[in-house]
């Protein structure tokens, strides 16, 4: 292992949201038998470029009159996709994004798919199932996640810079061992992503290797670098 080398310590991106091609797990809810039917709202982080499937409430087709998906995306008019069972008619209003579609024909499957998920798909999605006795709702606050690109380099004598570039939401950076760190800098991009930069200095020569740990909803990443022992020498590693 050469001096001043940058090593990927863990790229174990622990995807708790490993596959978004299945519907979100059902939440614990208790339905009562009144006409006021429960509305379930779920916050759901989804990784960009994956396939996401959003589900309606568990109402069988035989009990339905109309299935409606309402899609509210930032800065766009509300899009509505609906299917009326009696007439076998599908209708769309203000829906322009071709990546958001029914999984199948609505009479076969009422689920909605986003393929692939883009950063612009942040928003609120609601399935409304109309039955003869009232409506059932299931809503999703979809938060699109973007994995940041992590870089680590020694900028000058025993000072390291760790960057988590263009992540969504902002990543968190920590160091092992702790150094003398400048306040973390954040740069916001127009598309909703954030670059986080942390700069730290280690005065004592007893510290030879430092690790930058980046925590993010899409998974954690740690990089380490060997600090140059000789003052004045400047080298970066990839």
């Amino acid at each position: 292992q050469s001096n001043n080398s940058l090593m990927l310590q863990t790229s174990k991106e622990n995807h708790t949201l490993a596959s978004n091609s299945l519907c979100m797990d059902e939440k614990q809810i208790t339905q009562n038998h009144s006409k006021v039917l429960a509305e379930v709202n779920i916050s759901w982080p989804v990784q960009m470029a994956r396939n996401a499937v959003l589900c309606c409430p568990p109402i069988e087709f035989r009990n339905l009159i109309v299935i409606t998906w309402e899609i509210i995306l930032r800065g766009q008019p509300s899009c509505t996709k609906s299917y009326r069972k009696e007439t076998n008619e599908t209708k769309e209003t203000n829906c322009t994004d071709e990546r958001i579609t029914w999984v199948s024909t609505p009479d076969q499957n009422s689920d909605l798919q986003i393929h692939p998920v883009a950063i612009t798909h942040d928003g609120y999605y609601r399935c409304i199932m109309a039955t003869p006795d009232g409506n059932f709702h299931r809503g999703y606050h979809l938060q699109v996640l973007v994995t940041p690109e992590v870089t680590l380099f020694e900028s000058r004598n025993r000072t390291a810079v760790c960057k988590a570039v263009a992540g969504k939401p902002a990543a968190q950076i920590s160091w092992i061992p702790a150094g003398d760190c400048a306040p973390t800098e954040q740069e916001y991009w127009g598309n909703g992503t954030v670059t986080v930069k942390s700069t730290c200095h280690w005065e004592g020569h007893n510290v030879s290797t430092v690790t930058c740990h980046v925590s993010h909803l899409t998974g954690n990443k740690s990089l380490y670098i060997e600090l140059l022992p000789v003052p004045g020498a400047k080298k970066s590693a990839k």
Epitope: E26, H33, C55, P58, N63, P132, D133
Partner: antibody, heavy 119, light 111 residues
Framework: EVQLQQSGPELVKPGASVKMSCKAS????????MHWVKQKPGQGLEWIGY????????KHNEKFKDKATLTSAKSSSTVYMELSSLTSEDSAVYYC????????????WGQGTLVTVSA | DIVLTQSPASLAVSLGQRATISCRAS??????????LHWYQQKPGQPPKLLIY???NLESGVPARFSGSGSGTDFTLNIHPVEEEDAATYYC?????????FGGGTKLEIK
């Protein structure tokens, strides 16, 4: 209050037919699917089929396709099941049960109709 | 058709203890993010009574000592603490597609 009232016990001869009823009250009859379930003495439950009174949509368990005929009468809020060509294997308690929208569960059941097939 | 296998066929549990009943499906009962697996209690001479729906949701009016868990193909009904009135036969049911099917039943006896 939702109630499903089933007709009384029947003693019938082999080869004959029997028609039992399930009268619904306490809700809009045509809004909910009604299912029928069989339970032989000391045994488990077996799904027979359903009828949707709204449009008379009917689905059967293949096993009961030629055995059970399901009908409904909107005017009296009643569903019926007729069993034909009876044998001792048809001796059982028959339940009607209303399907709830959410999860297709059976939250309301009739008290059951006992059918005894005997010579 | 999905086959539901319940175990044990019968069990005896002391008052106040935990009763655990298992239901295994021949294939996954999960459809569109939901497990269409319900639990019923039946006492002699009575119709079944719904306890748990969609694997883990307690039906209105059912005591909180009843709970359901599981996903995919393996499901469990737990009763804790068991009371005298819980002596009954318990059935799991699948309702995700036709035909609906029931497990063979588990008879619970209170010691």
């Amino acid at each position: 209050e939702v109630q499903l009232q089933q007709s009384g016990p029947e003693l019938v001869k082999p080869g004959a037919s029997v028609k039992m009823s399930c009268k619904a009250s306490g809700y809009t009859f045509t809004s909910y699917v009604m299912h029928w379930v069989k339970q032989k003495p000391g045994q488990g439950l077996e799904w027979i089929g359903y009828i949707h009174p709204y449009n008379d949509d009917i689905k059967h368990n293949e096993k009961f396709k030629d055995k059970a005929t399901l009908t409904s009468a909107k005017s009296s809020s009643t569903v019926y099941m007729e069993l034909s060509s009876l044998t001792s294997e048809d001796s059982a308690v028959y339940y009607c049960a209303r399907e709830e929208y959410y999860g297709s569960r059976f939250a309301y059941w009739g008290q059951g109709t006992l059918v005894t097939v005997s010579a | 058709d999905i086959v539901l296998t319940q175990s044990p066929a019968s069990l005896a549990v002391s008052l106040g203890q935990r009763a655990t009943i298992s239901c295994r499906a021949s294939k996954s009962v999960r459809t569109s993010g939901y497990s269409y697996l319900h639990w019923y209690q039946q006492k002699p001479g009575q119709p079944p009574k719904l306890l748990i729906y969609l694997a883990s949701n307690l039906e209105s009016g059912v005591p909180a000592r009843f709970s359901g868990s599981g996903s995919g193909t393996d499901f469990t009904l737990n009763i804790h603490p068991v009371e005298e009135e819980d002596a009954a036969t318990y059935y799991c049911q699948y309702s995700g597609e036709l035909p609906f099917t029931f497990g063979g039943g588990t008879k619970l006896e209170i010691k």
